[in-house]
Amino acid sequence: KESCDVQLYIKRQSYHSIFAGDPFKLECPVKYCAHRPQVTWCKLNGTTCVKLEGRHTSWKQEKNLSFFILHFEPVLPSDNGSYRCSANFLSAIIESHSTTLYVTDVKSASERPSKDEMASRPWLLYS
């Protein structure tokens, strides 16, 4: 029998290599059984995760999963960093693993580097 706990399907140590100026959607896949939980996004600042207020978010429903989406319209250099989603379920907080956005500013890169280059060359990234 499948667990009816809320589960957040963000892979541990996952990352996204993206470019400043582009639109981007950061998805938090949520599995739940009956009532959809309240989900929020936060951005890590050291060990503290600061809740993102007033940001454009939306839900997308698929067959077995819902997605709570954080929209970047467009991506800014300051969006570089690690993000986590959290679900409020039966008075408990369920936290996802964090996922990292590596933002490259296309103005400072003569051509767009590959995903592998961006993951292995931190000097391309904003901190």
Partner: antibody
């Protein structure tokens, strides 16, 4: 049932490349990270790198950076590891391993592929 | 890179014995989610490794309960409470907290 079936043994000359495949079944490959690990004859295990089949992202050990490429074909649930500029020290059994990416709930290993590099 | 040091490198024991293998990491394996990503693998000659334990102490499905894992931070232990003939193999610890992921050098468990 769960299976990771790797391609057969290869003999390569120094300077050549080898591409090892790992066909998975019994789970959704997009929910996992695929690791590649090698074991030289009589030696221990050495981590080469990791591929995320959901988006193609990779992480490689520094030692293999620039010489290894990991890819995934989600339509066939098959992953690949290509190692170039082979030298005799690359002679080893190469393993793929699939670890669930969210909660580490499973960790399956392929049977291994012997790659021999010899002139 | 994180060094994983196993001890002993080899061990002779008899069926029914209680056996302990230790693994020490050169820095803490505690991730920022508060968990330590430390696995124990078993490998028999000519075979692929098999995961026995993950997240320090969680047993993989189908792994006999005589196997147990414990530890935190930098010091970890694999215990086999009562050795069975099929347990004679090489055991590796593997950390997947920090890149690059690293293995211990292995502990070969032999029949006395």
């Amino acid at each position: 049932q769960v299976q990771l079936v790797q391609s057969g043994a290869e003999v390569k000359k120094p300077g050549a490349s080898v591409k090892v495949s790992c066909k998975t079944s019994g789970f959704n490959i997009k929910d996992t990270y695929i690791h590649w690990v090698r074991q030289a004859p009589g030696q221990g295990l050495e981590w080469i790198g990791r591929n995320d089949p959901a988006n193609g992202n990779t992480k490689y050990a520094q030692k293999f950076q620039g010489r290894v490429t990991m890819t995934a074909d989600t339509s066939t649930s098959t992953v690949y590891m290509e190692l170039s500029s082979l030298r005799s020290e690359d002679t080893a059994v190469y393993y793929c391993a699939s670890y669930e990416g969210y909660y580490e709930r499973f960790g399956y290993w392929g049977q291994g592929t012997l790659v021999t590099v010899s002139s | 890179d994180i060094q994983m040091t196993q001890s002993p490198s080899s061990l002779s024991a008899s069926v029914g014995d209680r056996v302990t293998i230790t693994c020490r990491s050169s820095q803490s394996l505690l991730d920022r989610d508060g968990k330590s990503y430390l696995n124990w693998l078993q490998q028999k000659p000519g075979k692929a490794p098999k995961r026995l334990i993950y997240l320090v102490s969680k047993l993989d499905s189908g792994v006999p309960s005589r196997f147990s894992g414990s530890g935190s931070g930098t010091d970890f232990t694999l215990t086999i409470s009562s050795l069975q003939p099929e347990d004679f193999a090489t055991y590796y610890c593997w950390q997947d907290t920090h890149f690059p992921y690293t293995f211990g050098q292995g502990t070969k468990l032999e029949i006395k």
